[in-house]
Amino acid sequence: GITIPRNPGCPNSEDKNFPRTVMVNLNIHNRNTNTNPKRSSDYYNRSTSPWNLHRNEDPERYPSVIWEAKCRHLGCINADGNVDYHMNSVPIQQEILVLRREPPHCPNSFRLEKILVSVGCTCVTPIVHHVA
Amino acid sequence: GITIPRNPGCPNSEDKNFPRTVMVNLNIHNRNTNTNPKRSSDYYNRSTSPWNLHRNEDPERYPSVIWEAKCRHLGCINADGNVDYHMNSVPIQQEILVLRREPPHCPNSFRLEKILVSVGCTCVTPIVHHVA
């Protein structure tokens, strides 16, 4: 990895297993201010592999609300607007970091957690298995 | 919002703006142990809106490596394997949380940051604009 020269103004760490436990400022800095808010708002409907969005809420997690995509069809929508079962709608998944309250119900103590979320769906050519 | 009963064993917080700054344990708990590691490994190639994955590295960020999807085509791949420009390949984007070292180069002090990443691509019917 890349060695980072340490800033002398860093907070102290008493932790021998440093940096296992760190201080995190929850005032979120949003780097997306210049993005177009319409960027993907209707793709779930216009895609050839359309999806629905389901709300997943967990008060012990930060962020507490995550939206999960579920593909509407097994196949993909063709030019006639019908489902073509020779193609497959599949979820595009991504691992994301969330904060899990630990110990439970503590407002200022968390543990990093990696969860898998489905972000949307894409249309793929199926893998055809030929039986000998 | 939901009120969480406070656990009496929680760490103390001296911060008046509590919980602006919190303690986070970086020993990641991975909830995805039963997921198939190949889950979407080849969708980028098999999709009708295929994409390339580009490595984005930033030592001041945690995680330091993020993979960004870039759609290969402006159109989508049709049944003949050609690009159909009557359809559009578009990136599916998601806002994710990352930790940004703050002050810079500090190993144990972070700020939450929201960034927009392209996870993959999907094929959509374009919005056709009729000129009067």
Epitope: T35, R39 | E68, K70, L74, H86, N88, V128, H129
Partner: nanobody, 125 residues
């Protein structure tokens, strides 16, 4: 914000070649499909060429296909338009644009959120 600056336009003889450059600064350049448009005196701005985010695919207007080539160099944050076999009717101000909304087809002008100031190309017969 993204700033786009075009260069490379000049007076050239019919049949000649030119390479236009579009240098981008600001937000991450590689996040965008890019396009070239042109506007001749008294005419509407029209699509010339576009390139995908990855650089693997390009699309062209019928009137430049086979003569013009669009490419991108993400390391230099630059998009190029290589123009050959130039004709007097190619005379126009050429504009570089970055597409961020993806709401229509790649050649629809309103899909492009960021624009340069343009560079003048004049083809004499």
């Amino acid at each position: 914000e993204v700033q786009l600056v075009e260069s490379g336009g000049r007076l050239v003889q019919a049949g000649g070649s030119l390479r236009l450059s579009c240098a981008a600064s600001g937000r991450t350049f590689t996040s965008y499909p890019m396009g070239w448009f042109r506007q001749a005196p008294g005419k509407e701005r029209e699509f010339v060429a576009a390139i995908s985010m990855s650089g693997d695919d390009a699309a062209y207007a019928d009137f430049v296909r086979g003569r013009f080539t669009i490419s991108r160099d993400d390391a230099r944050n630059t998009v190029y338009l290589h123009m050959t076999s130039l004709k007097p009717e190619d005379t126009a101000v050429y504009y570089c644009a970055a597409r961020t909304s993806y709401d229509g087809t790649y050649d629809y002008i309103d899909d492009y959120s960021y624009w340069g100031q343009g560079t003048q190309v004049t083809v004499s017969s």
